[in-house]
């Protein structure tokens, strides 16, 4: 079965940025990864950023940057410009659409405790949904 | 099928403002990711930049920042792009097109004459 | 921003024959990570918005008859089209699709003789 790993990562140097790390574990194609924050796409989520394979990568503030780490895996830089740091206790969602297996998405946090430059383990919440 | 509509030609006089529309059909709602493009007469094509339906969030061309707002109703599934302080400079064919410029509006020109 | 060139800015063929038009990105347009180039070819017909012809340097998209072909890698790419048709008649434009603000090329303009 598809699997979909998340990791949120504060910079040790920088307390406001944070990286999302996805990975996509299976056979199969991708066609496109979403990645949400507040919640799963189309579930009360709010999309920051669309990456395509080939015709390129988009994404919205607080997201600073969206890029292809591996041909299965993206990041995604966040730049938080409050004085709070909202991130903490937002979880992120990304959505793999892969062919021929359909669409699967997991969820991650920063942990409470995270030290600066501590990722989250990568144990994801998987919503597997195969649209 | 997905089909990007324009609203028609427009005369305006300089120093005005002026909203044209773009309103999509044939996708889902939250998909309606959409670029603005300009091409000048006998000229490339612009980035004029882009808006994300989930959020408003905005991008934009450096140069076409303070010139061009953009905003959408999700009701209607319609996008808008307001430029200001019209110039002849900004007489043009504006375009909108989907997230990955795969699919492109008719266009819609925009005539600034005193 | 990444300056996209191309060349030359107009040609003319006959029907039948091959064509080559050129693209030069000031940037390389390739992603490391999962080593595609993000470049995009369009086609403007008199009247008409941009098609999408090519995408990721060469990847045909749907519908384009096969007679069109992308190629290239990092900052030069190239569009032939094998056997010109009359229907080919159009402005052909190259786009940065790596970075914003996504630049678009000069443009070609291929005549049919």
């Known amino acids: 079965t598809p699997e979909v790993w998340v990791q949120v990562q504060m910079e040790a140097t920088e307390l406001s940025s944070f990286t999302v790390h996805c990975g996509f574990l299976g056979p199969g194609s991708i066609s496109l990864v979403t990645v949400s924050w507040g919640g799963p796409d189309g579930a009360g989520g709010t999309k920051l950023a669309v990456l395509h394979p080939e015709l390129g990568t988009r994404q919205w503030a607080p997201a600073r940057q969206a890029r292809w780490e591996t041909q299965s895996s993206i990041s995604l830089a966040l730049e938080d410009s409050g004085a709070s740091s909202p991130f903490a206790n937002t979880t992120f969602c990304c959505k793999f659409a892969s062919f021929p297996e359909g669409s699967w998405e997991s969820c991650g946090s920063l942990p409470p405790s995270s030290d600066p430059g501590l990722s989250a383990p990568p144990t994801p919440v998987p919503i597997l949904r195969a649209d | 099928e997905v089909q990007l509509q324009q609203s028609g030609p427009e005369l305006v006089k300089p120093g005005a403002s002026v909203k044209i529309s773009c309103k999509a059909s044939?996708?889902?709602?939250?998909?309606?990711?959409m670029n603005w493009v300009k091409q000048s007469h006998g000229k490339s094509l612009e980035w004029i930049g882009d808006?994300?339906?989930?959020?408003?969030?905005?991008n934009f061309n450096q140069k076409f920042k303070g010139k061009a707002t953009l905003t959408i109703d999700k009701s209607s599934s319609t996008t808008y792009m307001e430029l200001r302080s019209l110039t002849s400079e900004d007489s043009a064919v504006y375009y909108c097109?989907?997230?990955?410029?795969?699919?492109w509006g008719q266009g819609t020109t925009l005539t600034v004459s005193s | 921003d990444i300056v996209m060139t191309q060349s030359p800015s107009s040609l003319s063929v006959s029907a039948g024959e091959k064509v080559t038009m050129s693209c030069k990105s000031s940037?390389?347009?390739?992603?490391?990570?999962?080593?595609?180039?993000?470049l995009a070819w369009y086609q403007q017909k008199p009247g008409q918005p941009p098609k999408l012809l090519i995408y990721?340097?060469?990847t045909r998209e749907s519908g384009v008859p096969d007679r069109f072909t992308g190629s290239g890698s990092g900052t030069d790419f190239t569009l032939t089209i094998s056997s010109v048709q009359a229907e080919d008649l159009a402005l052909y434009y190259c786009?940065?699709?790596?970075?914003?603000?996504?630049?678009f090329g000069g443009g070609t303009k291929l005549e049919i003789k």
């Open positions: 097109a989907s997230l990955f410029f795969d699919y």
């Open positions: 044939g996708y889902t709602l939250t998909d309606y990711y």
């Open positions: 808006i994300n339906p989930n959020n408003g969030g905005t």
């Open positions: 940037q390389s347009l390739l992603n490391s990570g999962n080593q595609k180039n993000y």
């Open positions: 990721g340097a060469s």
């Open positions: 786009q940065n699709a790596h970075s914003s603000p996504y630049t």
